[in-house]
């Protein structure tokens, strides 16, 4: 099996942006890797975003994705934007070594992302 490491806690910025590193220990020489960010709330797991990349190439999420990222070796730097207080929760990094076979799955323990909505600016007279 494949070990995936990610930070336990991250605090989103006042602009609703959270970044964290997802690192995996590859048991083989994969050329195609898929990275997925999952959100776990209670026992429900939903997909936040996903990207497949070829080793040595850049990580590309879909245009409408709330995620961006860069990759370097077995390390992926993930950024999630547009977060609100209601999005506070556990975000799991899932890594799949897709090609060549065999397939390997790696699931991190999750990063608890805390999002605090900024206080509205007081009206000035």
């Amino acid at each position: 099996a494949m070990h995936v490491a990610q930070p336990a806690v991250v605090l989103a910025s006042s602009r609703g942006i959270a970044s964290f590193v997802c690192e995996y220990a590859s048991p083989g020489k994969a050329t195609e890797v898929r990275v997925t960010v999952l959100r776990q709330a209670d026992s429900q797991v939903t997909e936040v975003c996903a990207a497949t990349y070829m080793m040595g190439n850049e990580l590309t999420f879909l245009d409408d994705s709330i995620c961006t990222g860069t990759s370097s070796g077995n390390q992926v730097n993930l950024t999630i934007q547009g977060l609100r207080a209601m999005d506070t929760g556990l975000y799991i990094c899932k890594v799949e070594l897709m090609y060549p076979p065999p397939y390997y799955l790696g699931i991190g323990n999750g990063t608890q992302i805390y999002v605090i909505d900024p206080e509205p600016c007081p009206d000035s007279d």
């Epitope: 099996a1 494949m2 070990h3 048991p27 195609e32 898929r34 997925t36 999952l38 797991v45 939903t46 997909e47 996903a50 497949t52 899932k94 799949e96 897709m98 090609y99 076979p101 065999p102 397939y103 390997y104 799955l105 699931i107």
Partner: antibody, heavy 118, light 108 residues
Framework: QVQLVESGGGVVQPGRSLRLSCAAS????????MHWVRQAPGKGLEWVAA????????YFADSVKGRFTITRDNSKNTLYLQMNSLRAEDTAVYYC???????????WGQGTLVTVSS | EIVLTQSPGTLSLSPGERATLSCRAS???????LAWYQQKPGQAPRLLIY???SRATGIPDRFSGSGSGTDFTLTISRLEPEDFAVYYC?????????FGQGTKVEIK
């Protein structure tokens, strides 16, 4: 709710072909890996094949490699298993199963019986 | 290929008794990638436990899973009549995905 419905099973002679289908509903089909698992009469579960997301990544058990092909049509929310050069030992109930976000097989179809006999 | 060996092959117990099923892997399996399924005659398998110890949606708390490395256990604390079935463990951390040969829990 998630539903998987297999079809296409039947009786076929050794050496012939058969195509199984699995119609999926109740979830975003393209976001999940899909599997075929079979069970010979009175025996245990045997994983057969898997196909990922856009269909470009496929994996097969050694027992079917070179004979079976797995495909998916995301526009039709349907999974397929093309079985060629069938043998008596391929006789089994074939289930399709969804690979959940965390990897386990969280939903299964009711199965379709394939009997290979002359 | 990771080979999973389940024991015992058959477990004969009475309703209300505790059932302990074992699954041993030929090489280390992270607990994140070990599942248990229940199958009744003529039915498809049903997910009980994933990640070695997390109960699937709708599964009663009399079912629990534990273990790590190469040794995993499914425990049914008090057998109900509907629990008599065949149970399979599975690893899903790498291909090929593999299942144990199953343990049949039958009424004594």
């Amino acid at each position: 709710q998630v539903q998987l419905v297999e079809s296409g099973g039947g009786v076929v002679q050794p050496g012939r072909s058969l195509r199984l289908s699995c119609a999926a509903s109740g979830f975003t089909f393209r976001s999940f890996g899909m599997h075929w698992v079979r069970q010979a009469p009175g025996k245990g579960l045997e994983w057969v094949a898997a196909v990922w997301y856009d269909g470009s990544n496929k994996y097969f058990a050694d027992s079917v490699k070179g004979r079976f092909t797995i495909t998916r049509d995301n526009s039709k929310n349907t999974l397929y298993l093309q079985m060629n050069s069938l043998r008596a030992e391929d006789t089994a109930v074939y289930y399709c199963a969804r690979g959940g976000h965390l990897g386990h097989f969280d939903y299964w179809g009711q199965g379709t019986l394939v009997t290979v006999s002359s | 290929e990771i080979v999973l060996t389940q024991s015992p092959g058959t477990l004969s117990l009475s309703p209300g008794e505790r059932a302990t099923l074992s699954c041993r892997a030929s090489q280390s399996v992270s607990s994140s990638y070990l599942a248990w399924y229940q199958q009744k005659p003529g039915q498809a398998p049903r997910l009980l436990i994933y990640g070695a110890s997390s109960r699937a949606t709708g599964i009663p708390d009399r079912f629990s899973g534990s273990g790590s490395g190469t040794d995993f256990t499914l425990t049914i604390s008090r057998l109900e009549p509907e629990d008599f079935a065949v149970y399979y463990c599975q690893q899903y951390g790498s291909s090929p995905w593999t299942f144990g040969q199953g343990t049949k829990v039958e009424i004594k």
